[in-house]
Each structure stands twice: as structure tokens, then as C-alpha cells.
Amino acid sequence: LDSPDRPWSPLTFSPAQLTVQEGENATFTCSLADIPDSFVLNWYRLSPRNQTDKLAAFQEDRIEPGRDRRFRVTRLPNGRDFHMSIVAARLNDSGIYLCGAIYLPPNTQINESPRAELSVTERTLEPPTQSPSPPPRLSGQLQGLVIGVTSVLVGVLLLLLLTWVLAAVFPRATRGACVCGSEDEPLKEGPDAAPVFTLDYGELDFQWREKTPEPPAPCAPEQTEYATIVFPGRPASPGRRASASSLQGAQPPSPEDGPGLWPP
């Protein structure tokens, strides 16, 4: 066999470390630097004995699912990137993953990507109003922060409730106090409101904004700022991976070329 001019470029498998909460989807991306006419792409998990267990495969524009249908491989429209997703990750899905490419004749090469680690953590936060599921990749520090912010919120709410109860029981005591906001100067909202800070790519969004107008209620002269934890429920932004299943192929494949182009 005539050896190539230059060495083969490696496969990449990213991210190198991925943390998701149980029940959420975990998505790795396997990327080919070059697209040969004919190849097989396999997705593996390393067993405790350091053996590769095949989860799913892609060949000739055919997805070959493994025994567990939760493991999905999707070819992206650029032809060289593949999303490898675990649907509804379980705690025991934590482990080491990689992809491997078998380049079929005449190239006849076997390439293996670097390994990547998946950590599936227990679900810790479940706000009652939450409709979209919390995004993946909560680090330990962030989880601590979330618990802290939640505790503060609960405390502030209890304090407000207590104030309201006191105001209701002892109305005379609050008569002299100011009412925050008036008809002349309504509370600020809209364009002048505080900026929105976004930590994206599947992390929590922290949106700091001023309290929206409410019926005048007794309060202290200093205005309280409220922190709202918002779980992203909007369409994927540039920083976050789009759902692999939402990606459409642009054109049907030309099979005689091999899988060098379009997704299935």
C-alpha cells in the first residue's frame, strides 16, 4: 500500500469533560478532519476493564443504533461533525467515551479519538414553575451558588411575608412610612432596567433585573433588588449546542461518492 504524503489528522471528540444532570441529554461531538469516500464511525464507552463497548455506529449514510436506543449518532450538515448523544442520561452513564473511525479501502486506516469523560449528577434543583428542563454542565461551584441564591430567595420571601403579616396586624405602625413608587414616578422598567447577564452553553442564566410594579405595598425607603434564576427555555444561542435532531440535511446524498456529504 502506498503510504500517504502526510500523516492522518486525528479525530477530535469534545468536550473533554461533560457534566449533565440525570434525565438530561448529554452530547459529544466527534469530528473528522478529512472525509474519505468510505468510512465507518463508531461510538464507544470504555468498560471498567478498559475494553471498548460499541454504543452506536454510522456507515454510508446509515445510522446503526446499538442495543440501547438512547445512544444516538447524528451527522451534521457540514459532513465532518457528528453529534453523539445520550438521551435522558442516567447516573450509571457516567464514564469514559470516545469515537473511532475505520477508513475503508483504499485508505484502510483505523483512528481513535482522545477520550472524554461524562459525569451524570443527581438532580438537585427542581423549581415548581420550571417547564424546560435545566441545562447540563452544572459544576460543583455553580450548584453551591444556586443553593445559596435559592436560600436567600426563600429568606427574602419569608421576610416579606412577615412584614406583610405585621402590617396587616398592626396597620397604625406603618401609616407614616413611604409607599415605594407613585403615580408621578412609576418604578423603572423596560430599556432603563438593569442589564441581563448571560452565562450560556448550558449553564445557568442569571438575569438581574429590578422588581416589576406591584400594587403599592408598605416597604422600607430603600428598594430591594431581587435575583431571579431563569432556566433557559429559549432557542439555542450561538454559545449552546443546537439539538442534533433539529438539524436537517440540505440535499439528499449522492451514495456513489460514499458518505462524504449529507446527513441521512
Partner: antibody, heavy 116, light 112 residues
């Protein structure tokens, strides 16, 4: 519609050089390996060289190795074949073909004549 | 290198008849994935070669179902049923099991 248009063929003296070009259209060029195949005056087809989609690797036939260089410019959808130290046996119609080995599409060819 | 052998000329055929064109390899083109790495091309007079069959038996897109490919690891046949005038030309087989890729010398199909 897939189109491959070769150019650069000419009459050249032995020992001379020539650079062939192939402009591709109608498909995402950077997603495909590309090849050069030539047809000799006796109508035989001979594979010359192949380059991968991202230029990471290339292969050559023994008859041209060290004299010819295959390259590509994905930004310009163009495949090249730089031919040096040309010999009379290099006289042929040179075709560019899409693919590393399956050659699903071919250009119309460009004639290279090496003669004193 | 893998050597591909073809008969240079087939017997002239009458339009509407069937014809078989053979091709032989000095090495098996059957790979461990179960595929046989052989292509068939047709070059009509004055035109560039056109892919007809890839991986021994799969028709390329747009190719008439009158063309079919078969064979073992080393002996291959291209069958053309109900031959028409537009089928006239030179048929080449090509191995793609390994580099250097090699072609047969071609088989010329002529009508009576």
C-alpha cells in the same frame, strides 16, 4: 449540477513544467477528496494522484511520485496538479474526478502533450 | 500493484440482445466489511468516463437498471440487457481495494 472544468493543458518540452487546474461547482468542494486520472493515447486510464478533502493526506502513482504535486484551494473550489520534469510518456488527457477512489464525476479533460 | 485484466473487444452485439463484459483481478477485491471494491465505468465516444457501478454491484445514480454488476472476489461481470445504441463505448473496470488504484485496459462494445 456538479461541474468540473480542467485547464492548463499545453504542449511542453521534456523536462518542462506545467500546472493544471480544475474548478469545481455544484457541490461542497471541501467535503470531498479529489483525484487526477489521465488517459494515454492508447486509451488506457491511469490514476495519477488523490488528495483528501482537507488536504491532510495525498497519494501518488509510482510513475509520477516526486515529480507531480496535487494540491487544492477549498476557498476557491479549485484542484491543482503541478507537473515537473515532464516526460514524453506523460502525454495524455488529464481528468479531474470527484472522490478519492469512486470517481462519481469527471471533468471534460485537458490535453498535455510532452514532445521535443 | 493489483493487476486488472479485461478482454479488449467483445463480440459485436445486435441491438436488443444482452451482453456480458468480464474483468479479472490478480488479488481478491473482497474486503472484511463484506464489500467488493470494484467499479465499472463507461466511456462513450468523445466523452469522459461515467461511473456505472460501484462496489461491484451498486448502480450509480441515474444509471439504467439494464446494467448490473456481479462477481466473486477476483472475477467480475458487467451484464447489459437489451443493448441500445447509447451503450456503445469502452467499458473499464477499476479496483479500489488499495493504492495505487488501477484500471483494466477496457472492453469495447460495438453493435452489429
Amino acid at each position: 449540477e456538479v461541474q468540473l472544468v480542467e485547464s492548463g493543458g499545453d504542449l511542453v518540452k521534456p523536462g518542462g513544467s506545467l500546472k493544471l487546474s480544475c474548478v469545481a461547482s455544484g457541490f461542497p468542494f471541501s467535503n470531498f477528496g479529489m483525484s487526477w486520472v489521465r488517459q494515454t493515447p492508447d486509451k488506457r486510464l491511469e490514476w495519477v494522484a488523490t488528495i483528501s478533502s482537507g488536504s491532510s493526506y495525498s497519494y501518488y502513482s509510482d510513475s509520477v511520485k516526486g515529480r507531480f504535486t496535487i494540491s487544492r484551494d477549498n476557498a476557491k473550489n479549485t484542484l491543482f496538479l503541478q507537473m515537473n520534469s515532464l516526460k514524453s510518456e506523460d502525454t495524455a488527457i488529464f481528468y479531474c474526478a470527484r472522490g478519492e477512489s469512486r470517481f462519481a464525476y469527471w471533468g471534460q479533460g485537458t490535453l498535455v502533450t510532452v514532445s521535443a | 500493484d493489483v493487476v486488472i485484466t479485461q478482454d479488449e473487444l467483445s463480440n459485436p452485439v445486435t441491438s436488443g440482445e444482452s451482453v456480458s463484459i468480464s474483468c479479472r483481478s490478480n488479488k481478491s477485491l473482497l474486503y472484511e466489511d463484506g464489500q467488493t471494491y470494484l467499479n465499472w465505468f463507461l466511456q462513450r465516444p468523445g466523452q469522459s468516463p461515467q461511473l456505472l457501478i460501484y462496489l461491484m454491484s451498486t448502480r450509480a445514480s441515474g444509471v439504467s437498471d439494464r446494467f448490473s454488476g456481479s462477481g466473486s472476489g477476483t472475477d467480475f461481470t458487467l451484464e447489459i440487457s437489451e443493448v441500445r445504441a447509447e451503450d456503445v463505448g469502452v467499458y473499464y473496470c477499476q479496483q479500489l481495494i488499495e493504492y495505487p488504484l488501477t484500471f483494466g485496459a477496457g472492453t469495447k462494445l460495438e453493435l452489429k
